[in-house]
């Protein structure tokens, strides 16, 4: 008997497991800079981190997770969106670099946003037309009476036992799926060696199935993304984020689950389920 249905069942199981684990994943935050990402020396810049409603801490990370700034001054931009603003009043060369956002929405931390590269250049006489991710201005803009600068926020903690079991379970299912696929491929090879397939359809169908699975997964991932969140108030001074100046930018993939080097505030148990990190680098022209 052909293992065709078995392989399909394996794929369906795999798919169901993946979608199940994605069920409670948080949407990635977005990051933008105002007035842009190319800033004259001495001018101000505001990083805007946006995420879903209910975010309690937004973190702006610079270059690596060891340099970050937290704010709990989160504004509700709309019934389904929240944002925080991190302002640098007087940009120095040391502020140039890669920035990204991450947020804490109980009981867990989100993935990081894409990187945004801040370029600092010498002030020139003429007006700038900086490369920027345009922000949609929606609703009244109020200024808060204080710019709280919160140093620490709860860091992602180690895996709890139950999460370890889930992880092992997912791994086992994944390996089982791989094994099924390998066996299926071997079986197909044997069939090919033994003689030509009975019909064209029979040859094509197995190759189409994985694509279908990938397509469903991609659409699931798309649905979890929140984009184009409007702007609102709250700004936090981020001058503490200024680190050593660097002429060249090194793109490094950072471990999302590594503990930060700062002392992190104790927090009640939270889900620390690892997730595949898809890093997109913001391509910005140097002037």
């Amino acid at each position: 008997m052909s293992p065709h249905p078995t392989a399909l069942l394996g794929l369906v199981l795999c798919l169901a497991q993946t979608i199940h684990t994605q069920e409670e994943d948080l949407p990635r935050p977005s990051i933008s800079a105002e007035p842009g990402t190319v800033i004259p020396l001495g001018s101000h810049v505001t990083f805007v981190c946006r995420g879903p409603v209910g975010v309690q801490t937004f973190r702006l990370e610079r270059d690596s997770r060891s340099t970050y700034n937290d704010t709990e001054d989160v504004s509700q931009a709309s019934p389904s969106e929240s944002e925080a603003r991190f302002r640098i009043d007087s940009v120095r060369e040391g502020n140039a670099g890669l920035y990204r956002c991450i947020y804490y929405k109980p009981p867990k931390w989100s993935e990081q946003s894409d990187y945004l590269e801040l370029l600092v250049k010498e002030s020139s006489g003429g007006p700038d037309s900086p490369d920027t991710e345009p922000g949609s201005s929606a609703g009244p803009t109020q200024r808060p009476s204080d710019n709280s600068h919160n140093e620490h926020a709860p860091a992602s903690q180690g895996l709890k036992a139950e999460h370890l079991y889930i992880l092992i379970g997912v791994s086992v299912v994944f390996l089982f799926c791989l094994l099924l696929l390998v066996l299926f491929c071997l079986h197909r090879q044997n069939q090919i060696k033994q003689g030509p397939p009975r019909s064209k359809d029979e040859e094509q169908k197995p190759q189409q199935r994985p694509d279908l699975a990938v397509d469903v997964l991609e659409r699931t991932a798309d649905k979890a993304t929140v984009n184009g969140l409007p702007e609102k108030d709250r700004e936090t001074d981020t001058s503490a984020l200024a680190a050593g100046s660097s002429q060249e930018v090194t793109y490094a993939q950072l471990d999302h689950w590594a503990l930060t080097q700062r002392t992190a505030r104790a927090v009640s148990p939270q889900s620390t389920k690892p997730m595949a990190e898809s890093i997109t680098y913001a391509a910005v022209a140097r002037h």
Partner: antibody, heavy 121, light 109 residues
Framework: EQSLEESGGDLVKPGASLTLTCKAS?????????MCWVRQAPGKGLEWIAC????????TYFASWAKGRFTISKTSSITVTLQMTSLTAADTATYFC?????????????WGPGTLVTISS | ELVLTQTPAPVSAAVGDTVTIKCQAS??????LAWYQQKPGQPPKLLIY???TLASGVPPRFKGSRSGTEYTLTISDLECADAATYFC???????????FGGGTEVEIK
Amino acid sequence: EQSLEESGGDLVKPGASLTLTCKASGFSFSSSEFMCWVRQAPGKGLEWIACIYGGLSDDTYFASWAKGRFTISKTSSITVTLQMTSLTAADTATYFCARSCDVNYYGFDPWGPGTLVTISS
Amino acid sequence: ELVLTQTPAPVSAAVGDTVTIKCQASQNKGTNLAWYQQKPGQPPKLLIYLSSTLASGVPPRFKGSRSGTEYTLTISDLECADAATYFCQSTYYGSNGLTFGGGTEVEIK
């Protein structure tokens, strides 16, 4: 309409244990909320006890004074319980169940009417 | 641990007056506040969350604001139905916990 109702309040002796139950109507627990317990001693203020995450994981949050003696758990997608042990007269209060939802930035809404727990010998 | 201190203790005002209740947070972390109204024999009712956002169905006579670590609930055009005890609460799931203030009773003259 979304509502909550507590049950299990009783008159018990010091040192006894008691389990309170909160049942949701009009909604079931989801990954965007927490189910919480708050108590209020007669003529006193509100005192937060504990919360449990409504999603797949069972993340729990406790007031520092409540750790150890109190246990919060989800028994179904619409019920949450609060187990209390080694009860003393100081635990005499009306116990409220409330939902803490991200849409209200985790403000507690709705609340149940409360169930009275009296500890007396 | 976060401590929320509410002042004044009891407030007495006439119908049509404006009443201001303050809630002072002991630290500037995780202190986005919610305000509740509680009448005798009833559970509390959410009025304001995220320090200044009105909860559904709450009249705009109730206004929340923040200045540093001081949070204010202002009730304008006071009505008889506003006679109640008002509580502030930190709605942060971090180490501060979900602390409540001691409560402020508002009575109508």
